[in-house]
């Protein structure tokens, strides 16, 4: 017996061939011997089966001895053994119709679980293998679960249902609602304007929700809310903003925040959360601000950084065009009685400069001794 796999909603063609390439009598019946369709004279006739309005045949191929049955808009209940009777012989075709759907909305927050459910007829023994856009492979029986979705799981999932060495492929589009980056760090010199950007990793027709940026300054004992905002159809409106610092927020996506001045007291890390309408849970992005200051006071040249820096970062003071350098894996370096010239303060990671600040040291003339 031939086995044919079909997809719910699709069209399937069950083939039946006569040995002689000519138009002849044929009938298609289901397992209960109820006639579905057949030929009477030169005309296609239909029986009292449930399939009558969805079953058809390719009349153009009859004279070639091909008496296929086409079933449109397949339903799981169409799964059955179909019998083609032609030239005093019977050909049996077992049709198994499957459907694969996501249990919940296909727009899921990062970290949420995805469950794919296979709709299958009684008597089937399917297995399912799914491949994520990022190349992750999962397999199961009638249910497949991905416990924690990641950004890279966004896109088209390809799932193959196998039964009796036959396969049928399903494509399911999954959108993981997340920010493009989990974390980002902005490096600024003291006094510079700071731009924070929070681009989303997805696009939606209508995007509505509310968000907040909480900030933990390095120098502060507790965190505080810097800004709260609403999002309505991709339009951003500020609800409440702290007085210090006076943040500004862009009115369009991507979410964009401007801090007028980078100051040591603002250095630290923040967490932007975004709650989307009709979604449980929140999107998160961490943002860090590192501020650098270079100062000369009397005979001491100092370079300092504030904010979250990793221990492997190097802070250096270097005299331009000269070999003189002071380096430390620390948050402050200094030079006593620095030579005159342009000094560079550099914050670097394995040789890559993340932040630099220049400071000019002017020569100090010895104070004339009073006679």
């Amino acid at each position: 017996k031939k086995v044919v796999l079909g997809k719910k909603g699709d069209t399937v063609e069950l083939t039946c061939n006569a040995s002689q390439k000519k138009n002849t009598q044929f009938h298609w019946k289901n397992s209960n011997q109820i006639k579905i369709l057949g030929i009477q004279g030169l005309f296609l006739t239909k029986g009292p089966s449930k399939l009558s309005d969805r079953a058809d045949s390719r009349k153009s191929l009859w004279d070639q001895g091909c008496f296929s049955m086409i079933i449109k808009n397949l339903k799981i209940e169409d799964s059955d053994t179909y019998i083609c009777e032609v030239e005093n012989k019977k050909e049996e075709v077992e049709l198994l119709v499957f459907g694969l759907t996501a249990n919940s909305d296909t727009h899921l927050l990062e970290g949420q679980s995805l469950t794919l459910t296979l709709e299958s007829p009684p008597g089937s023994s399917p297995s399912v293998k799914c491949r994520s856009p990022g190349g992750k492979n999962i397999q199961g029986g009638r249910t497949i679960s991905v416990p924690q979705l990641e950004r890279q799981d966004s896109g088209t999932w390809t799932c193959t249902v196998s039964q009796d060495q036959k396969t049928v492929e399903f494509k399911i589009d999954i959108v993981v609602l997340a920010f493009q980056k989990a974390s980002s760090t902005v490096y600024k010199k003291e006094g510079e304007q700071v731009e924070f950007s929070f681009p989303l990793a997805f696009t939606l027709e209508k995007l509505t929700g509310s968000g907040e940026l909480w900030w933990q300054a390095e120098r502060a004992s507790s965190s505080k809310s810097w800004i709260t905002f609403d999002l309505k159809n991709k339009e951003v409106s500020v609800k409440r903003v702290t007085q210090d610092p006076k943040l500004q927020m862009g009115k369009k996506l991507p979410l964009h925040l401007t801090l007028p001045q980078a100051l040591p007291q603002y250095a630290g890390s923040g967490n932007l959360t975004l709650a989307l309408e009709a979604k449980t849970g929140k999107l998160h992005q961490e943002v860090n601000l590192v501020v650098m200051r270079a100062t000369q006071f009397q005979e001491n040249l100092t370079c300092e950084v504030w904010g979250p820096t990793s221990p492997k970062l190097t802070l250096s003071l270097k005299l331009e065009n000269k070999g003189a350098t002071v380096s430390k894996q620390a948050k402050a370096v200094w030079v006593l009685n620095p030579e005159a010239g342009m000094w560079q303060c550099l914050l670097s990671d394995s040789g890559q400069v993340l932040l630099e600040s220049n400071i000019k040291v002017v020569p100090t003339w010895p104070t004339p001794v009073q006679p």
Partner: antibody, heavy 125, light 107 residues
Framework: QVQLVESGGGLVKPGGSLRLSCAAS????????MNWIRQAPGKGLEWVSY????????FYTDSVKGRFTISRDNAKNSLFLQMNSLRAEDTAVYYC??????????????????WGKGTTVTVSS | EIVMTQSPAALSVSPGERATLSCRAS??????FAWYQQKPGQAPRLLIY???TRATGIPARFSGSGSGTEFTLTISSLQSEDFAVYYC?????????FGQGTKLEIK
């Protein structure tokens, strides 16, 4: 542990209705296909209905089509059988049962392994 | 629908002896076949699925064989708790069907 407990059975007159419930516990109910099977007094077993994990795919045996409705509430871990236009021949113990599977390499074997203790339905005037 | 025919309808065997129960399907059910045991006032208990795979917790004295249309359940050495009604079951085609049962009695 895995448990299925049926309830809602009782005595009903021909033409009457009953709603059977099956409370599931000890497993993730929403992952499993479920079934109702019945056994007339002193008789053999008859498969009544089959429902997919999502509730979208449903099959009935011919003798109950149009009269019985199987449904499920995954949030409440419950399976139901609404029985209308009851007849004397519907008198039976009704069992709810879970479809299980095991796999060997890529091949999956399905079977009905977990049954409840049953609830008795008597249709009599 | 597929008709399942069990033989014999009743079987009397002494404890410790071997019992062989048969089941025939009216058409091929491949290996989508199971055996159940039922004791009075209890729900059926799955013994064998996939024609020959023992269900979890089923003693090794129970074994199933066959495929297509002919199936056999063998109990190698009968224990007192094995006396019950045994049903065969096909789950290849809807509606799923059972045999009429074989009553295994103590001789």
């Amino acid at each position: 542990q895995v448990q299925l407990v049926e309830s809602g059975g009782g005595l009903v007159k021909p033409g009457g209705s009953l709603r059977l419930s099956c409370a599931a516990s000890g497993f993730t109910f929403s992952d499993y296909y479920m079934n109702w099977i019945r056994q007339a007094p002193g008789k053999g077993l008859e498969w009544v209905s089959y429902i997919s994990s999502s509730g979208k795919t449903i099959f009935y045996t011919d003798s109950v089509k149009g009269r019985f409705t199987i449904s499920r509430d995954n949030a409440k871990n419950s399976l139901f059988l609404q029985m209308n236009s009851l007849r004397a021949e519907d008198t039976a113990v009704y069992y709810c049962a879970r479809e299980d599977y095991s796999n060997y390499e890529d091949y999956y074997y399905y079977y009905t392994g977990v049954w409840g203790k049953g609830t008795t339905v008597t249709v009599s005037s | 629908e597929i008709v399942m025919t069990q033989s014999p309808a009743a079987l009397s065997v002494s404890p410790g002896e071997r019992a062989t129960l048969s089941c025939r399907a009216s058409q091929s059910v491949s290996s989508k076949f199971a055996w159940y045991q039922q004791k009075p006032g209890q729900a059926p208990r799955l013994l064998i699925y996939n024609a020959s795979t023992r269900a979890t917790g089923i003693p090794a004295r129970f074994s199933g064989s066959g495929s297509g249309t002919e199936f056999t359940l063998t109990i190698s050495s009968l224990q007192s708790e094995d006396f019950a009604v045994y049903y065969c079951h096909q789950y290849k085609n809807w509606p799923y069907t059972f045999g009429q049962g074989t009553k295994l009695e103590i001789k």
